[in-house]
């Protein structure tokens, strides 16, 4: 398929199995879990990474206050439901037939229910809030270093145009990424912010997707940026539905 | 000085494809997000997508999406661009235009002007 | 998609007049950064457009400070103090804010 390597490989997903079966012996590649083909020369849907990685062996003040709308992924790992094309369905349910809504990037958006419980349409995560704390250095990173540092990085490795990052926050030891896509601004072929948030997560914990790539080695003018806590908030184009009884919790 | 220089008119058969070329000089050409725009005669214009010469990464206009190719050499800092199934309405120029810092589109191409006749 | 609309069609003009053109979007166009990525070209006869305007009011380099462009949210305005000659030709509006459009174009002629 597109960008699968002359040895067979796919350079943005190592979760993959790939073989010369495509056209005219073309490299192909599908996606672990799912089986379905890839797209090599960009990035793979998140869904299709969870259902890969849970098919896997199991190894071992200028910064922004989250809306009240604000998602977090405390649900975790799940083995998720995607369509054709790659994409979380709407409506997500375990083997013991608990079902549960989610949004574009596969967070839970309602209290959970069962089988009658419907979701209507797959709801756009349109902004995403990544929240790093790095570890201790000599000084303060310089922030238009900073800024641009990291706008590169999801431009060249997570291939995001670079419209899509609409803000880098600083206060020492806090960055904030805010990441903006609404449907209007989303071309044919774009990566999808949900995406590279999750290549970039992936980055972060050591846990890189890419093929045969070192891990991320983020720098700014030559001084390593190490992470050492990160929270994603998402915030959906409709406000999530949960009961009061949650929201009190 | 910047630079895109656009290759030479086309007149192909309907059903035929056609691969247009826009060579770049003057800057960084794996720096810049490389654009395409359809301009029909005496009509407004459209655009098709995008391409980012660094990794390849592309972003089309959903009318296009099933059209349009877009493919860089960054050996030879040249863009490319293939039509396929090629219609009547698909006569038009074809520009290669680089986008700046600022997501507009500064510098463009001469134009590719494309004919499909029987 | 963003539907840009430019009026007028057409401006007769006399040299050293003032111009005025409009362009209206469909939505606002002001991104999630801040920034409002709305842009004006110029396209003479058997030439490529070229920019003139980008994120509403910056200049392109080159460009005579004749030219100057207005506006925010859905209306813009590109005006041309002193109209000359090598003005004439047909002006179009652009965002980028949004998958790209363009307006339809207006047409600028000698009165």
């Known amino acids: 398929h597109t960008a699968a390597q002359d040895n067979c490989t796919c350079p943005t997903n190592k979760m993959t199995v790939c073989s010369p079966d495509g056209p005219g012996g073309r490299c192909q590649c599908r996606a672990l879990g799912s089986g379905m083909a890839v797209d090599c020369s960009t990035l793979t849907s998140k869904c299709l990474l969870l259902k890969a990685r849970m098919s896997a062996p199991k190894n071992a003040r200028t910064l922004v206050r989250p809306s009240e709308h604000a998602l977090v992924d405390n649900d975790g790992l799940y083995d998720p439901d995607c369509d054709p094309e790659g994409r979380f369905k709407a409506r997500q349910c375990n083997q013991t037939s608990v079902c549960w809504c989610v949004n574009s990037v596969g967070v839970r958006r309602t209290d959970k229910g069962d089988l009658s419980l419907r979701c209507d349409e797959l709801v756009r995560t349109h902004h995403i809030l990544i929240d790093l704390r790095h570890r201790p250095t000599a000084g303060a990173f310089n922030h238009s270093d900073l800024d641009a540092e990291l706008r590169r990085l999801f431009r060249e490795r997570y291939r995001l145009h670079p419209k899509f990052v609409a803000a880098v926050h600083y206060e020492q030891p806090t960055i904030q990424i805010e990441l903006r896509q609404n449907t209007s601004q989303k071309a044919a072929g774009d990566v999808d912010i949900g995406d590279a948030a999750y290549y970039f997560e992936r980055d972060i914990k050591g846990e890189s997707l890419f093929q045969g790539r070192g891990g991320l080695d983020l720098r700014v003018r030559g001084e390593p940026l190490q992470v050492e806590r990160t929270l994603i908030y998402y915030l959906d184009e409709i406000p999530p539905k949960f009961s009061m009884k949650r929201l009190t919790a | 000085e910047v630079q895109l220089q656009q290759s030479g008119p086309e007149l192909v058969k309907p059903g035929a494809s056609v691969k247009m070329s826009c060579k770049a000089s003057?800057?960084?050409?794996?720096?810049?997000?490389m654009n395409w725009v359809k301009q029909s005669h005496g009509k407004s214009l459209e655009w098709i997508g995008y391409i980012y010469p660094n990794h390849g990464g592309t972003g089309y206009n959903q009318k296009f999406k099933d059209k349009a190719t877009l493919t860089v050499d960054k050996s030879s800092s040249t863009a490319y661009m293939e039509l396929r199934s090629l219609t009547s309405d698909d006569s038009a120029v074809y520009y290669c235009a680089r986008e700046n810092y600022g997501y507009a589109m500064d510098y463009w191409g001469q134009g590719t002007s494309v004919t499909v006749s029987s | 998609d963003v539907v840009m609309t430019q009026t007028p069609l057409s401006l007769p003009v006399s040299l050293g007049d003032q111009a005025s053109i409009s362009c209206r979007s469909s939505q606002s166009l002001v991104h999630g950064d801040g920034n409002t990525y709305l842009h004006w070209f110029l396209q003479k006869p058997g030439q490529s457009p070229k920019l003139l305007i980008y994120t509403v009011s910056n200049r392109f380099s080159g460009v005579p400070d004749r030219f100057s462009g207005s506006g925010s949210g859905t209306d813009f305005t590109l005006k041309i103090n002193r109209v000359e000659a090598e003005d004439l030709g047909i002006y179009f509006c652009?965002?980028?804010?949004?998958?790209?459009?363009f307006g339809g174009g207006t047409k600028l002629e000698i009165k």
């Open positions: 652009s965002q980028t804010t949004h998958v790209p459009t």
């Open positions: 003057g800057f960084t050409f794996t720096d810049y997000y």
